[in-house]
Amino acid sequence: ESGYAQNGDLEDAELDDYSFSCYSQLEVNGSQHSLTCAFEDPDVNITNLEFEICGALVEVKCLNFRKLQEIYFIETKKFLLIGKSNICVKVGEKSLTCKKIDLTTIVKPEAPFDLSVVYREGANDFVVTFNTSHLQKKYVKVLMHDVAYRQEKDENKWTHVNLSSTKLTLLQRKLQPAAMYEIKVRSIPDHYFKGFWSEWSPSYYFRTPEINNSSGEMDPI
């Protein structure tokens, strides 16, 4: 769904593009869910514009968003999470554009955290581990993770590994010796829920050991 304004509906026939995008985060604060929307064009004049969600809500017909600078935000327990909601951009009582969205299809997980890399000298490998708050959640529990790593000097040469667990082993022979590496991880819903990649975790930096010339093996760090 494009979310483009039906400009023919506007009395003054303005050509403003009110397209917007949203993402939901479930159980982001205890049992509270959140919904964040923003205009795709950062230069839209948002002075009198409001967002409203109606339908697929518990106990209420509609909810208004809070405006936080350039974003619009709701935190609530009232999302039914079954069926589609109607999200509208409004000026007063007039709707400029609306989108019908199932909030379970626009889920953005929280970023993974506690990323670390441990070198195992005997095994000649690096064990990558990280954590995710979603292990404790009731709804969005199953995630696909994208671990990306690169030699720090290679700005855009990222190697990506997809996995469903929170542990990955990198073989030492696949990495350059005596090099600084950067590694990071993000997550996306992978079961009933659909949506977007999380933000990246904070990066972790590690150095690979040097090669021991006599044996052709790497020296420990």
Partner: nanobody
Framework: QVQLVESGGGLVQPGGSLRLSCEVS????????MHWYRQASGRQREWVAT???????GYRDSVKGRFTISRDNAKNTVDLQMNGLQLEDTAVYYC???????WGQGTQVTVSS
């Protein structure tokens, strides 16, 4: 063009305090998680703290209870209040918005008696 400008570093005695600030431009700041990293001389860069777009905070173990990260979405700034500074906190501190292709110049924090 993304710009990250850190400030507020300086020389402080152990146990002292500093407040670092980072001004961000060129991104939709309100929608981004923001991070502080640091790099001590001869060491690799390490993560220090994060504040998510929703305001949730996280810290590396060695600074928990001493450092506080905060953000002001109206000013596009992220701050790091550092109390109880220790010798091992000496480093250049950098803020980052999640894309590590972009770094500011950093701000030097030196803890010395």
């Amino acid at each position: 063009q993304v710009q990250l400008v850190e400030s507020g570093g300086g020389l402080v005695q152990p146990g002292g305090s500093l407040r670092l600030s980072c001004e961000v431009s060129g991104i939709r700041f309100s929608l981004r998680n923001m991070h502080w990293y640091r790099q001590a001389s001869g060491r690799q860069r390490e993560w220090v703290a994060t504040i998510t777009a929703g305001g949730v905070t996280g810290y590396r173990d060695s600074v928990k209870g001493r450092f506080t990260i905060s953000r002001d979405n109206a000013k596009n700034t992220v701050d790091l209040q550092m109390n109880g500074l220790q010798l091992e906190d000496t480093a250049v501190y950098y803020c980052n918005h999640g894309d590590t292709a972009y770094w500011g110049q950093g701000t030097q924090v030196t803890v010395s008696s």
